[in-house]
Interface confidence: low
């Protein structure tokens, strides 16, 4: 006859490990007992358990409550055992010795491998600001046994660098994602993907990118200067910019205080019925914690009576 076992048994931390040992004998052969021992512990063999055909299972004190026989029905030639709740320290070489009648003793070894799945963590880098050079966006660390794989999933353009540290029974892998911040990255997901044989599926942690920026300011409302004439109602100037964090707006007049009746409403400057007093240079000041921008425009309120001659000239010239 011969023993059937596995070269390697692999389990995930906390799972039960089945250590197989089956005697495939000739007709009429019987198994008297099966002895299980750990054989790589450094101090000779360490007994786990003894399965006796007549007296049942005896577990050594060091493994009390952790070694069981597989659930019935059981084949009398099957000397397999279950090692409950595998921990990293269980990783190593195990031997089963089978005493048979009349063929004598047989032994076989197997290696138990305990996978320790990683628990990844993602740490954002320093605050991202448009105009910076290559900057750390985030780093992702995962420790496990064997070493996990750490990659990035994102549509953002960047570079990655990885390093690993080996510990006695595991390895920690850290991957960093660097990028050149731009406003188009705002709100984009940056996902750390951790793969490991002990995981049923990849673990993913997503960080949402926040890039501080402030766009150039511009003022709308003066596209048609001819609309800015005495008596016109509802005239307004609107300051256009975009930023992260969202910017605040402030309006001033360069050549004096804002005329009475002019309303400031955030990015909008609303005018009462226009008079020549509203002519002047207006400045929109946009700012956030990152930066500030200015845009100025000249308002020239037209007097239709002064311009009536010009209008006629233009018509006759055509």
């Amino acid at each position: 006859g011969e023993l059937e076992t596995s070269d390697v048994v692999t389990v995930v931390l906390g799972q039960d490990a089945k250590l197989p040992c089956f005697y495939r004998g000739d007709s009429g052969e019987q198994v008297g007992q099966v002895a299980w021992a750990r054989v790589d512990a450094g101090e000779g063999a360490q007994e786990l358990a003894l399965l006796h055909s007549k007296y049942g299972l005896h577990v050594s004190p060091a493994y009390e409550g952790r070694v069981e026989q597989p659930p019935p029905p059981r084949n009398p030639l099957d000397g397999s055992v279950l090692l409950r709740n595998a921990v990293q320290a269980d990783e190593g070489e195990y031997e089963c010795r089978v005493s048979t009648f009349p063929a004598g003793s047989f032994q076989a070894r197997l290696r138990l491998r305990v996978l320790v799945p990683p628990l990844p963590s993602l740490n954002p880098g320093p605050a991202l600001e448009e105009g910076q050079g290559l900057t750390l966006a985030a780093s992702c660390t995962a420790e496990g046994s064997p070493a996990p794989s750490v990659t990035w999933d994102t549509e953002v353009k960047g570079t990655t660098s990885s390093r690993s540290f080996k510990h006695s029974r595991s390895a920690a892998v850290t991957s960093e994602f660097h990028l050149v911040p731009s406003r188009s990255m705002n709100g984009q997901p940056l996902t750390c993907v951790v793969s490991h044989p002990g995981l049923l599926q990849d673990q993913r942690i997503t960080h949402i990118l926040h890039v501080s920026f402030l766009a150039e300011a511009s003022v709308r409302g003066l596209e048609d200067q001819n609309l800015w004439h005495i008596g016109r109602e509802g005239a307004m100037l609107k300051c256009l910019s975009e930023g992260q964090p969202p910017p605040s707006y402030n309006w001033t007049r360069l050549d004096g205080p804002l005329p009475s009746g002019v309303r400031v409403d955030g990015d909008t400057l609303g005018f009462p019925p226009l008079t020549t007093e509203h002519s002047g240079i207006y400045v929109c000041h946009v700012s956030n914690e990152f930066s500030s921008r200015d845009s100025q425009v000249t308002v020239d309120v037209l007097d239709p009576q002064e311009d009536s001659g010009k209008q006629v000239d233009l018509v006759s010239a055509s």
């Epitope: 628990l119 990844p120 963590s121 705002n186 709100g187 997901p189 996902t191 673990q203 993913r204 942690i205 997503t206 960080h207 949402i208 975009e242 992260q244 969202p246």
Partner: antibody, heavy 118, light 107 residues
Framework: QVQLKQSGPNLVQPSQSLSITCTVS????????AHWVRQSPGKGLEWLGV???????DYNAAFMSRLSITKDNSKSQVFFKMNSLQADDTAIYYC????????????WGQGTSVTVSS | DFQVTQSPASLSASVGETVTITCRTS??????LAWYQQKQGKSPQLLVY???TLADGVPSRFSGSGSGTQYSLKINSLQPEDFGTYYC?????????FGGGTKLEIK
């Protein structure tokens, strides 16, 4: 698979506190945080607060003075406590796991129906 | 105050039809938006996050789109199980408000 199981009272006296425990399985609270949301009868959803995986919290300003969210990573439990309840706090209260994107709620508890009445 | 306006408040449609629900925000939320479905007496379920990404297990007849302040959820070829109430939620600046909801009923 991921599960969030809520336990807490269904009836609370006015001016008293509400405590709900959300026990999670299938993921670790050190990897994903949890939101709390409520839904008043016949109404929409109202976001109350969040506890991040690192343990820090953000609350809806409207509830900040009377809301506390804490957790025990080792027991896989998130704890919700709201003080000084009134009749208009009658609602279904939900805990929900933060998803891959770091914000949205990809798994929800079964909800705890709470009536505030004497 | 930050506003999230969801429309329409209710909608009747037949199986096989295509419907679109919209959410408008009072400021640019840079795609920080999720969509949820809730059926009567049940907890909500995530459909879409980051405005456009389908959550695990969500059928491809659902799709999210939009940018800036306007976002929409489109359901192609409505199925009987799609009827319920839909909510959007932004994650731009706290508090992370939900839209008022859209009740999708069978015609």
């Amino acid at each position: 698979q991921v599960q969030l199981k809520q336990s807490g009272p269904n009836l609370v006296q006015p001016s008293q506190s509400l405590s709900i425990t959300c026990t999670v399985s299938g993921f670790s609270l050190t990897t994903y945080g949890a939101h709390w949301v409520r839904q008043s009868p016949g109404k929409g959803l109202e976001w109350l607060g969040v506890i991040w995986r690192g343990g820090s919290t953000d609350y809806n300003a409207a509830f900040m003075s009377r809301l506390s969210i804490t957790k025990d990573n080792s027991k896989s439990q998130v704890f919700f406590k709201m003080n000084s309840l009134q009749a208009d706090d009658t609602a279904i209260y939900y805990c929900a796991k933060i998803g891959y994107d770091g914000y949205a709620m990809d798994n929800w508890g079964q909800g705890t129906s709470v009536t505030v009445s004497s | 105050d930050f506003q999230v306006t969801q429309s329409p408040a209710s909608l009747s449609a037949s199986v096989g039809e295509t419907v679109t629900i919209t959410c408008r925000t009072s400021e640019n939320i840079h795609n920080y938006l999720a969509w949820y479905q809730q059926k009567q007496g049940k907890s909500p379920q995530l459909l879409v996050y980051n405005a456009k990404t389908l959550a695990d297990g969500v059928p491809s007849r659902f799709s999210g789109s939009g940018s800036g302040t306007q976002y929409s959820l489109k359901i192609n070829s409505l199925q009987p199980e799609d009827f319920g109430t839909y909510y959007c939620q932004h994650f731009w600046s706290s508090p992370w408000t939900f839209g008022g909801g859209t009740k999708l009923e069978i015609k």
